[in-house]
């Protein structure tokens, strides 16, 4: 799947209206200087690919973000504005049900969420450049 056929304006609107607020709430209590993240994405579909990677897949310090409010809203937004996206998620939902529930220490995930904020900001910037 690639994100080429998504409605990027609608995704931007959803991000600015809700997802961004949830990400900032998750990061509350941290300073922007706490994480030295150099994240980049080259265009709008690529930004969404990177966002998909870091929102719904484990990394070494953060086992899962999928149940966080911003992740649920991200999934809903992509399902709504990216044709065919929902079909890619069926196996993932089934796989998640089989998986053991694991306790995640929130602060271990802060760096990754900081990376996500950077990716979303780049997504918005690439959108502005195209207009």
């Amino acid at each position: 799947y690639d994100f080429t056929n998504c409605d990027f304006q609608k995704i931007e609107a959803d991000y600015l209206r809700t997802i961004s607020k949830d990400l900032i709430t998750y990061m509350s209590g941290t300073k922007s200087t706490d994480f030295n993240n150099t994240v980049s994405c080259s265009n709008r579909p690529h930004c969404l690919t990177e966002i998909q990677s870091l929102t719904f897949n484990p990394t070494p310090r953060c086992a899962s973000l999928a149940k966080e409010m911003f992740a649920r809203k991200t999934k809903a937004t992509l399902a709504l504005w990216c044709p065919g996206y929902s079909e890619t998620q069926i196996n993932a939902t089934q796989a998640m049900k089989k998986r053991r529930k694991r306790k995640v220490t929130t602060n271990k995930c802060l760096e990754q969420v900081s990376q996500l904020l950077g990716l979303w900001r780049r997504f918005i910037r690439t959108l502005l450049k195209k207009q």
């Epitope: 994240v39 690529h46 897949n57 196996n91």
Partner: nanobody, 117 residues
Framework: EVQLVESGGGLVQPGGSLRLSCAAS????????LYWYRQAAGIERELIAS???????NYVDSVKGRFTISRDNSENTMYLQMNSLRAEDTGVYYC???????????WGQGTLVTVSS
């Protein structure tokens, strides 16, 4: 489906360096998130490094600053540069490729790294 083959393991002295490679064949490597795992004797396999298609990296605390994960999508290869190796880095290193949408994961067969004087 992606098939993965690791190489580059071996015996190295404490403080030394090694570079592991993970060569992929098949489709899907380009957008998948890639991982290096380590399994020491009697210990559960541990995720130590990850890299997205665009090169965003994350590391477990114990290897941060010493190990560097990288990927070359044109060559379908991932690397793990390991510096300042310690005895506790000994183990079998596995590469893995995970579909970012449905979570299906392919594994390599592993390569043994032994850090000993």
């Amino acid at each position: 489906e992606v098939q993965l083959v690791e190489s580059g393991g071996g015996l190295v002295q404490p403080g030394g360096s090694l570079r592991l490679s993970c060569a992929a064949s098949g489709s899907g490597f380009g957008v998948n998130i890639l991982y290096w795992y380590r399994q020491a004797a009697g210990i559960e396999r541990e995720l130590i490094a990850s890299i997205t298609s665009g090169g965003i990296t994350n590391y477990v605390d114990s290897v941060k600053g010493r190990f560097t994960i990288s990927r070359d999508n044109s060559e379908n290869t991932m690397y793990l540069q390991m510096n300042s190796l310690r005895a506790e880095d000994t183990g079998v290193y596995y590469c893995a490729s995970r579909n970012i949408f449905d979570g299906t994961t392919e594994w390599g067969q592993g390569t043994l790294v032994t850090v000993s004087s």
